[in-house]
């Protein structure tokens, strides 16, 4: 607890102090006072620097004195032998004695009293910026007129802060301008404009005179502009050293004018105004800005349109243009959006064709579709070359965005048929000679594949079984072979409307319009052993003449067995219809005259006993295309005959082309279109 006075005596005083003693006293007087410490008696063993025994006086970290020996007063009217005056309110006194004393020493007696200090004069650092007033136990600071005392109660300044300027134009000056500005002041001015406007400050060089910088280049008095995280300044000196036009890029500006205690000048004056916030004319590649202006400011709206072949991708949606607004922060809205090259994406695959993986799928890239040759060709032309167009589609010069269509090549066997020996009187054949050949297992018969979805056969083959099981691609009809071949599943059977359905088909004598189509559930994949035969054209070129040769194939009856295990084939000439009429029916089910012969029938055979027979029905009578010798077309279908090994009758396919085309068109699937 601080006291105003006190007494300090060495141990055992006034008796001799003991050896080996160390004792300290902490003196504390109230704050605002100093300490006057004085000794009235001093009798301590003398040694050099008071090394043996001593009394030490310490103020803070400073030793105020160290005493030893004997002292007596110089003034007969005063008992004081030694005294100390400190301007602080704390003091420490330490007494030390060593292990021996050659004589008897009585120690010391000392007293302290609290004394007033003059804070205004007693310290190197002046406590007040302007006027200092001392009183017992303290001091107070005061200010000249028009100044006020800051919260620290020491510094005076002028009341120059707190002004907020919101007008779009204005003028601000230092206090008293053009008279000298006040010392020791911090003036803060705030300019706050509405968002979207930037503060632009303009000064004239001659309107600025602020105490110059020191030798190190530090401004003693300074003017600073702060706009968000940007700072302009500090500025000082005679004549404004900074840019005379400061574009702050912000709607908020703080002006800070800081002065020290010395060197007042006339100060400064500035003007400010609010400019609509400019947005930079950004270079957005591959696009056009509308409207085009030299400068864009707050609230300006532009439409940015991508050049052809470029698009704005936002999420999953592509657009060709977007709007951007100059925002209050000087940035464009939608600035993340960019015009990127249109990406046409991975090209769609096509059935029975392929497209090479493109190096790029961006605007201008080129891809090429090809069909699986030699079994498919590109039906709808266009060459298969597509480029990535500006609208994001792969486009062909002829077809536009429509994909190429790979359709089976018809009538081209992988291996030509060669007669090895003289169906009846026929030769062994390979399915590659007749890749269109279809095998029906119930009844045992044949058919001709005419495209991916359709099989052509005789009406009498399917009239009793509307769900026939068919196979393609096998030379042998042994079970193990068929299990490895392609089984075809029918979707629907279409029998020609002119075919007369009978209660007892075995007694049939009229085979007119013996033609049917089987629509398949799934498309057939073409290859060396499976490939369609062409249909005849409608022109007179496809009218058969007597002697024209055609090929027949099948697993029907041969001389040796009821059913052939491996495919047989024969080359037959077309014969006049009367030749067929002249042959006696082998096992007639009616009068010979009852058998019907019509122009819808072709008569062929009669040479070297070569003929089709039971089990060959529905198979094609294939004739070389007169307009393309590499191809065969189905001129006829094995229909009936008077006697195996003589002449046979074949349905004249040319007469049914319209019906075939119409039936296929009316019953096609979207996949086929």
């Amino acid at each position: 607890e601080p006291t105003m006075y006190g007494e300090i005596l060495s141990p055992n005083y006034p008796q001799a102090y003991p050896s080996e003693v160390e004792k300290s006293w902490d003196i504390e007087v109230p704050e605002g006072y100093g300490i006057h410490l004085y000794f009235t008696h001093l009798d301590i063993e003398l040694s050099e620097n008071c090394a043996y025994d001593s009394v030490q006086i310490i103020s803070g970290d400073t030793e105020e004195g160290r005493l030893c020996g004997q002292r007596s007063s110089n003034n007969p009217h005063s008992p004081i032998v030694e005294e100390f005056q400190v301007p602080y309110n704390k003091l420490q006194v330490i007494f030390k004695s060593d292990f021996s004393n050659e004589e008897r020493f009585t120690g010391f007696a000392a007293y302290y009293v609290a004394t007033d200090i003059n804070e205004c004069t007693d310290f190197v650092d002046v406590p007040c910026s302007h006027f200092c007033n001392n009183f017992i136990g303290g001091y107070f600071c005061s200010c000249p007129p028009e100044y006020f005392l800051h919260d620290d109660m020491k510094n005076c300044g002028v009341n120059c802060s707190g002004d907020v300027f919101t007008a779009l134009i204005g003028e601000i000056a230092s206090p008293n301008y053009p008279k000298p500005y006040p010392e020791n002041s911090r003036c803060e001015y705030q300019i706050r404009l509405e968002k979207g406007f930037q503060v632009v400050v303009t000064l004239r060089r001659e309107d600025f005179d602020v105490e110059a910088a020191d030798s190190a280049g530090n401004c003693l008095d300074s003017l600073v502009f702060v706009a968000g995280d940007r700072q302009f300044g500090p500025y000082c000196g005679h004549g404004f050293p900074g840019p005379l036009n400061i574009e702050t890029k912000s709607n908020a500006l703080d002006i800070i004018f800081q002065t020290d205690l010395t060197g007042q000048k006339k100060g400064w004056k500035l003007r400010y105004h609010g400019d609509p916030m400019p947005c930079p004319k950004e270079d957005t590649p591959n696009s056009v800005w509308e409207p085009a202006k030299a400068k864009y400011v707050f609230r300006d709206v532009v439409q940015i349109t991508c050049l052809d072949g470029f698009e704005v991708v936002e999420g999953r949606v592509g657009a060709t243009s977007f709007y951007s607004t100059c925002q209050s922060n000087g940035k464009w809205s939608n600035s993340k959006l960019k015009c990127q090259p249109v990406d046409c994406g991975i090209p769609e695959s096509i059935e029975n064709g392929k497209v090479e993986d493109p190096e790029s799928t961006l605007f201008g890239s080129v891809i090429r579709y090809t069909c699986e040759e030699p079994y498919y060709y590109m039906e709808n032309g266009g060459g298969g070359e597509y480029h990535c167009a500006g609208n994001g589609s792969w486009v062909n010069e002829v077809l536009g965005p429509e994909l190429p269509k790979c359709v089976p090549v018809c009538g081209v066997p992988r291996e030509p048929f060669e007669e090895k020996q003289r169906i009846i009187g026929g030769s062994d054949a390979d399915i590659k000679n007749f890749p269109w050949q279809v095998f029906f297992d119930n009844p045992w018969a044949g058919g001709a594949l005419i495209n991916e979805y359709w099989v052509l056969t005789a009406a009498h083959v399917v009239e009793g079984n509307r769900e026939p099981t068919m196979y393609v691609g096998s030379t042998s009809v042994q079970t193990s072979r068929l299990a490895k071949s392609k089984m075809l599943t029918p979707e629907h059977v279409f029998i020609h409307p002119g075919w007369k359905l009978l209660e007892v088909p075995e007694g049939r004598t009229n085979f007119d319009n013996d033609i049917a189509l089987v629509r398949l559930k799934d498309p057939v994949k073409m290859g060396p052993t499976v490939s369609p035969i062409c249909l005849p054209g409608t022109s007179s070129d496809y009218n058969l003449m007597d002697g024209d040769l055609g090929l027949i194939s099948g697993w029907g009856r041969t001389e040796k067995r009821d059913r052939a295990v491996r495919l047989k084939a024969a080359r037959l000439p077309v014969a006049p219809l009367r030749k067929c009429k002249e042959v006696k029916v082998e096992k007639p089910t009616a009068d010979a005259e009852a058998y019907v012969f019509t122009p819808n029938m072709i008569c062929a055979g009669g040479e070297k006993g070569m003929d089709s027979c039971k089990g060959d029905s529905g198979g094609a009578f294939a004739v070389q295309d007169p307009n393309d010798k590499t191809k065969f077309y189905a001129a006829g279908l094995v229909s009936w005959g008077p006697q195996c090994g003589t002449y046979g009758l074949y349905t004249r396919v040319k007469n049914y082309v319209d019906w075939i085309m119409k039936t296929m068109q009316e019953n096609s699937t979207p996949r086929e279109d």
């Epitope: 099981t469 042998s476 009809v477 042994q478 079970t479 193990s480 068929l482 299990a483 040796k560 067995r561």
Partner: antibody
């Protein structure tokens, strides 16, 4: 109708070989695919293999690979099946069977040949 | 090789009963499955081929169904001549394999 006539019953010692013949009549061997099937006494049917004329190769069941050989003599329309390194579990009736057409697995069966393996 | 599993191994039934035998393939065999009937000392006789096609001369009380891996032979009304052992056989690809057989005996 195809007829298949097999050779007579055989008794063999373990480690020996047996060769069973199968004579075709009513058709030619070249037009047929001959299979061999066996049946141990009181047990099920076991397919052994076949000659595939289309591929021109003989296909054997994995179980018999390396022990069985199937051959054909087209001049006499006779098929043969030889099984070597006989063991007691090879005691069975061995059938030659012609492959069917158009989905029928087997057409005609031989009468069977009993091969007994006993020491 | 494709494994064929027949069930049951033995089946006791009476004349006039409806009997069903099942056959399961270890992988898909499409419809390439046949059913045989075998009597002691005789060669097997083909009843059904291609899963559901009835061999000519076989009574219509026999029927087959299924495709892929699950197949069934049904005898709609068991006759005295039908007591025998029945085998299924796959012929989708070599090796051709048989089921272990189902013996249909008199109850």
């Amino acid at each position: 109708q195809v007829q298949l006539v097999q050779s007579g019953a055989e008794v063999k010692k373990p480690g020996a070989s047996v060769k069973v013949s199968c004579k075709v009549s009513g058709d030619t061997l070249t037009e047929l695919s001959m299979h061999w099937v066996r049946q141990a006494p009181g047990k099920g049917l076991e397919w052994m293999g076949t000659f595939d004329p289309e591929e021109g190769e003989t296909i054997y069941a994995q179980k018999f690979q390396g022990r069985v050989t199937m051959t054909e003599d087209t001049s006499t329309d006779t098929a043969y099946m030889e099984l070597s390194s006989l063991r007691s579990e090879d005691t069975a009736v061995y059938y030659c069977v012609t492959e069917g057409l158009a989905g029928r697995p087997f057409d005609s069966w031989g009468q069977g040949t009993l091969v007994t393996v006993s020491s | 090789d494709i494994q064929m599993t027949q069930s049951p191994s033995t089946l006791s039934a009476s004349v006039g009963d409806r009997v069903t035998i099942t056959c399961r393939a270890s992988q898909s065999i499409s419809s390439w499955l046949a059913w045989y009937q075998q009597k002691p000392g005789k060669a097997p006789k083909l009843l059904i081929y291609k899963a559901s096609s009835l061999e000519s001369g076989v009574p219509s009380r026999f029927s087959g169904s299924g495709s892929g891996t699950e197949f069934t032979l049904t005898i709609s009304s068991l006759q005295p001549d039908d007591f025998a052992t029945y085998y299924c056989q796959q012929y989708n690809s070599y090796s051709w394999t048989f089921g272990q057989g189902t013996k249909v005996e008199i109850k």
